[in-house]
């Protein structure tokens, strides 16, 4: 259905944008509180959205040092913004078998951001691999 695939595309474009925000934050990793955070890795199929919400819930924080505090806080806020709802996301919400956030290995900000980026890339890869060829506006 065209409008639902367009909605999915818009959703994945949002994921694409999140990768750039993660990359931006990686530049300021020394200005983040060096706290260990749950960082899902090798997420099992159908638990991607659950893992995604774990990354969003994590308490990534600026160390409030230097003049990078504003850009860091804005970037973190954007990472936590809820993406538009999709059928895939709704379906996965009903899965009770996905690991809880606390069960994932905790990692410092650098590895946390790298794993977040890997998950986002995996979700985009799944989306683009599962649909017919054509542009995001087709």
């Amino acid at each position: 259905h065209k409008s639902s695939s367009q909605g999915q595309d818009r959703h994945m474009i949002r994921m694409r944008q999140l990768i750039d925000i993660v990359d931006q934050l990686k530049n300021y990793v020394n200005d983040l509180v060096p706290e260990f955070l749950p960082a899902p890795e090798d997420v099992e199929t159908n638990c991607e959205w659950s893992a995604f919400s774990c990354f969003q819930k994590a308490q990534l924080k600026s160390a409030n040092t230097g003049n990078n505090e504003r850009i860091i806080n804005v970037s973190i806020k954007k990472l936590k913004r809820k993406p538009p709802s999709t059928n895939a996301g709704r379906r996965q919400k009903h899965r009770l078998t996905c690991p809880s956030c606390d069960s994932y290995e905790k990692k410092p900000p650098k590895e946390f951001l790298e794993r977040f980026k890997s998950l986002l890339q995996k979700m985009i890869h799944q989306h683009l691999s599962s649909r017919t060829h054509g542009s995001e506006d087709s």
Partner: antibody
Framework: QVQLVQSGAEVKKPGASVKVSCKAS????????MHWVRQAPGQGLEWMGT????????IYSQNFKGRVTMTVDESTSTVYMELSSLRSEDTAVYYC?????????WGQGTLVTVSS | DIQLTQSPSSLSASVGDRVTITCRAS??????LNWYQQKPGKAVKLLIY???RLHSGVPSRFSGSGSGTDYTLTISSLQPEDFATYYC?????????FGGGTKVEIK
């Protein structure tokens, strides 16, 4: 259809600033980030940075940090790129490009010439 | 920054020829590789995104393949309107970077 229309050519003196505009139409303006890319005469493409039109969040290339400012006028669906402290090496064609999964639509380019 | 090395930098070919352009990244870019076409005085056009996805309106004679660090753009049967400069671009990591370009000229 998606269209990005840029402002006309500019001639500037070294040390001056230039502000290039890019007016978007044919899609939901705030759904897509806008990137800026430049191309010096006879050279390849160089990424300058990006802006999210929904909240003016920016990411700039380290090569231009401190000299480039990207802004948005949501009421006219226009993105602006201002480059300050111009030098002769900034002579180039400047492009805006909408970003979905890639830079899927580009403006026609704006030639900026820096000459004393 | 991720470096992209395109080869060849230029090539001469005839209408109907099969043309292959390669792009090598300095690190694994996980298929986040796009191809663009540029003609003098015209807007840059996206041809292929995410290694092999054809952008809307792009003729099927254009195709892309690759993985890891090595990627290829193929034009199966060169048409008169295909004489242009082609660029690869990685979307894996900021900053966005482009290859040096490949100019396809008429033999």
């Amino acid at each position: 259809q998606v269209q990005l229309v840029q402002s006309g050519a500019e001639v500037k003196k070294p040390g001056a600033s230039v502000k290039v505009s890019c007016k978007a139409s044919g899609y939901t303006f705030t759904d897509y980030w806008m990137h800026w890319v430049r191309q010096a005469p006879g050279q390849g493409l160089e990424w300058m940075g990006t802006i999210d039109p929904s909240d003016q969040y920016t990411i700039y290339s380290q090569n231009f940090k401190g000299r480039v400012t990207m802004t948005v006028d949501e009421s006219t669906s226009t993105v602006y790129m201002e480059l300050s402290s111009l030098r002769s090496e900034d002579t180039a064609v400047y492009y805006c490009a909408r970003y979905g999964f890639a830079m899927d639509y580009w403006g026609q380019g704006t030639l900026v010439t820096v000459s004393s | 920054d991720i470096q992209l090395t395109q080869s060849p930098s230029s090539l001469s070919a005839s209408v109907g020829d099969r043309v292959t352009i390669t792009c090598r990244a300095s690190q694994d870019i996980s298929n986040f590789l796009n191809w663009y076409q540029q003609k003098p005085g015209k807007a840059v056009k996206l041809l292929i995104y995410y290694t092999s996805r054809l952008h809307s309106g792009v003729p099927s004679r254009f195709s892309g393949s690759g993985s890891g660090t090595d990627y290829t753009l193929t034009i199966s049967s060169l048409q008169p309107e295909d004489f242009a400069t082609y660029y690869c671009q990685q979307g894996h990591t900021l900053p966005r970077t482009f290859g040096g370009g490949t100019k396809v000229e008429i033999k």
